[in-house]
Amino acid sequence: MMTGTIETTGNISAEKGGSIILQCHLSSTTAQVTQVNWEQQDQLLAICNADLGWHISPSFKDRVAPGPGLGLTLQSLTVNDTGEYFCIYHTYPDGTYTGRIFLEVLESSVAEHGARFQIP
């Protein structure tokens, strides 16, 4: 039975050109994490394998940095980065756990409109 739960950073609204950290944490299970995949809209961004370490997809290499921990740092954000990101935890013996984070990247003009939030 899968008893674990994924906690995420929560949804994030950020400004174009900035950087943000996406993180997930698997709790309430003793299952062993064998690999964590980071994906966006069916595109693989990065893999962190327990044995082989990190692999960043070539198309994201210049803007995606591994960590902290099993998280992912996205740099030089563009409005095209707006979308849903998935952390997919492959575990043994439980199977797969998935967390969801929505990232909204705003143009400066939109970000300033009615802005009373702190923007990372």
Partner: antibody, heavy 117, light 112 residues
Framework: EVQLQQSGPELVKPGASMKISCKAS????????MNWVKQSHGKNLEWIGL????????SYNQKFKGKATLTVDKSSSTAYMELLSLTSEDSAVYYC??????????WGQGTTLTVSS | DVVVTQTPLSLPVSFGDQVSISCRSS???????????LSWYLHKPGQSPQLLIY???NRFSGVPDRFSGSGSGTDFTLKISTIKPEDLGMYYC?????????FGGGTKLEIK
């Protein structure tokens, strides 16, 4: 002035599919995400999903995956929601709503869907 | 999914009253940057829902200052300082911090 103009009420038969439109005006359509919300029995509000007009990306409430399909036509600044394999449970008022920082700042007028044989 | 519980379900009022509506979430609504995406809406019969408050306490443009929002973590409150006829309707809170966004069950503000 920001406006979201939705298509009119629909009466459809069980098993059919239908598409609701939401035409945006008064702002940059690609600069904001568009959400869809279901209101059943005049009370409960449920988030169905959203679409990012800029890149076509979508995010769905798992409950509505396979039931709703979201698309956009950037050239006409219009968002669409297709509802599939309709049953009486799908009878409701459906709203499109623009979002900024995960709050819904402007809403369409709502589209009433009645599923009945 | 995050469960959002609104109380009370119904709130009978007289014009001029001050009222509070509570919204509680099953987990903290602060993201890792300390930003909380909690908003409040008024839905009047025959109209679309309208945004009142975003980000816990920020009034949306054109919203009168008799509406105020407060709270943190899992506990949030909407206060209306002097009820007017145009304030009657259903009030909803919405959490937008976690996927999927979820609404509270609503509070009906009606005349006693």
């Amino acid at each position: 002035e920001v406006q979201l103009q939705q298509s009119g009420p629909e009466l459809v038969k069980p098993g059919a599919s239908m598409k609701i439109s939401c035409k945006a005006s008064g702002y940059s359509f690609t600069g904001y995400t568009m959400n869809w919300v279901k209101q059943s029995h005049g009370k409960n509000l449920e988030w169905i999903g959203l679409i990012v007009p800029n890149n076509g990306g979508t995010s769905y409430n798992q409950k509505f995956k396979g039931k709703a399909t979201l698309t956009v036509d950037k050239s006409s600044s219009t968002a669409y929601m297709e509802l599939l394999s309709l049953t009486s449970e799908d009878s409701a008022v459906y709203y499109c709503a623009r979002s900024l920082r995960f709050s819904f700042d402007y809403w369409g007028q709502g589209t009433t869907l009645t599923v009945s044989s | 999914d995050v469960v959002v519980t609104q109380t009370p379900l119904s709130l009978p009022v007289s014009f001029g009253d001050q009222v509070s509506i509570s919204c509680r979430s099953s987990q903290s609504l602060a993201n890792s940057y300390g930003t909380t995406y909690l908003s409040w809406y008024l839905h009047k019969p025959g109209q679309s829902p309208q945004l009142l408050i975003y980000g816990i306490s920020n009034r949306f443009s054109g919203v009168p200052d008799r509406f105020s929002g407060s709270g943190s973590g899992t506990d949030f409150t909407l206060k209306i300082s002097t009820i007017k006829p145009e304030d009657l309707g259903m009030y909803y809170c919405l959490q937008g911090t976690h996927q999927p966004p979820t609404f509270g069950g609503g509070t009906k503000l009606e005349i006693k």
